[in-house]
């Protein structure tokens, strides 16, 4: 959580950002809130990116003002116009690219004054893993698949019964480049699994951590998945 205060102007206003991560090829949100003004026309929002000459986005007098927008963001940005009046300056970024990573500044001007705060935006690929029983294998085998990751993650298996056990000797992980030549499909196979146990396939890179659980009993199979962005917690 980063809180910034304006330096010049009548007064400083509080602007707050939260570090976040974007999933390439999908839409992302750069989060920014501010001390609101009573009239929309008195609010100016500017998003800037370190190393980029033009603006990422500008919103003023109640509408987008994109004449100074940098080419790399053309047609890809939007604010939540109906929420600006309540202090939401967050930016929606369409079709996130690897090159969108960097330091952004959310700069706000209202009738009370000015304020800004920086935001670290990471980009990569992350997806939910699915764990299944591999019935084609000669022994009891689990297969964990996740369609899109970047940068290359680590994969670790764990089990509820054998807590702390190292499964690296009885597992095999491969990374297959997807058609766009950036993201990769993650496939990890765990051999010699036992029944009535819960196994977890944990995939992690510097952006996200995802877990796929599977519980295999004689009568049923239960699955659960969870994904957590690593750098969006308050700091």
């Amino acid at each position: 959580l980063i809180i910034g205060f304006g330096i010049s102007g009548r007064h400083s206003i509080t602007v707050t950002t939260v570090a976040s991560a974007g999933n390439i090829g999908e839409d992302g949100i750069l989060s920014c809130t501010f001390e609101p003004d009573i009239k929309l026309s008195d609010i100016v929002i500017q998003w800037l990116k370190e190393g980029v000459i033009g603006l990422v986005h500008e919103f003023k007098e109640g509408k987008d003002e994109l004449s100074e927008q940098d080419e790399m963001f053309r047609g890809r940005t939007a604010v939540f116009a109906d929420q600006v009046i309540v202090g939401n300056a967050s930016l929606r970024l369409k079709n996130v690219q690897l090159t969108d990573a960097g330091t952004y500044k959310c700069y706000i001007i209202t009738s009370k004054g000015k304020g800004n705060a920086n935001l670290e935006y990471k980009t990569g690929a992350f997806s939910m893993p699915e764990v299944n029983v591999d019935y084609n294998a000669s022994s009891e085998t689990l297969r964990c698949e996740a369609p899109r990751w970047f940068p290359q993650p680590t994969v670790v298996w764990a089990s509820q019964v054998d807590q702390g056990a190292n499964f690296s000797e009885v597992s095999n992980t491969s990374f297959e480049l997807n058609s766009e030549n950036v993201t990769m499909k993650v496939v990890s196979v765990l051999y010699n699994v036992t029944i009535n146990n819960t196994y977890s396939c944990m995939i992690e890179n510097d952006i996200a951590k995802a877990t796929g659980d599977i519980k295999v009993t004689e009568s049923e199979i239960k699955r659960r998945s969870h994904l957590q962005l690593l750098n969006s917690k308050a700091s």
């Epitope: 009573i38 009239k39 929309l40 026309s41 007098e61 109640g62 929420q83 009046i85 309540v86 939401n88």
Partner: antibody, heavy 122, light 113 residues
């Protein structure tokens, strides 16, 4: 139709806290601000602040910072206001009201609850 | 904070008469960007909650009778009731929403003779 139903009257002791509720119906709760106002014989109508249930954003009148805390529960479409460290000065009728239709300002206040009388007395 | 001053504090008129009440703000409520006056009028009948009558100084809220007329600009505003009815017995408040915190006048109490 839009309705705001406030909780019943409260008799509270000095120093205590009270939590008032405002149940909204007839519109999309997360799309509009809910405002709280105080009406007392000595001070007339005073605006306390608003909450935007869609995001939880709040904005307070400086005069009521530390006195009032606004929250909202999306699942029950209910807004709440907690008043703390109550004194006789806090005895008043408190209203909730819904913010306006326009995205250019959260005013005026077109829909009001019936009001909750809070009496602070030992 | 913007101070809203209403006058008179009370007045008594007969049914059918025309009545005007005044509201003055300590600073202009006319916003140059949109040429709107950020002022509203509310009616509060005894034992009830306030009801919005007029916003943007002169725009009727839906369902409000056209005998209620809002006028004025800048710092001086007027609410006129062209032909008073018995049901108009109430306190009338002006409200500025030009800047935070929004503020209200002390009200004008309309009584029926």
């Amino acid at each position: 139709q839009v309705q705001l139903q406030e909780s019943g009257p409260e008799l509270v002791k000095p120093g205590a806290s009270v939590k008032l509720s405002c149940k909204a119906s007839g519109y999309i709760f997360t799309d509009y601000t809910i405002h709280w106002l105080k009406q007392s014989p000595g001070q007339g109508l005073e605006w306390i602040g608003w909450i935007y249930p869609g995001s939880g954003h709040t904005h307070y009148n400086d005069k009521f910072k530390g006195k009032a805390t606004m929250t909202a529960d999306k699942s029950s479409t209910t807004a709440y206001m907690q008043l703390s460290s109550l004194t006789s000065e806090d005895s008043a009728v408190f209203f909730c009201a819904r913010g306006g239709e326009s995205i250019t300002t959260v005013f005026p206040l077109a829909y009001w609850g019936q009001g909750t009388l809070v009496t602070v007395s030992a | 904070d913007i101070v809203m001053s209403q006058s008179p504090s009370s007045l008594a008129v007969s049914v059918g008469e025309k009545v005007t009440m005044s509201c003055k703000s300590s600073q202009s409520l006319l916003y140059s960007s949109d040429q709107k006056n950020y002022l509203a009028w509310y009616q509060q009948k005894p034992g009830q909650s306030p009801k919005l009558l007029i916003y943007w100084a002169s725009t009727w809220e839906s369902g409000v009778p056209d005998r209620f007329i809002g006028s004025g600009s800048g710092t001086d505003f007027t609410l006129t009731v062209s032909s008073v009815k018995a049901e108009d017995l109430a306190v009338y408040y002006c409200h500025q929403y030009y800047s935070y915190p929004p503020t209200f006048g002390a009200g004008t109490k309309l009584e029926i003779k």
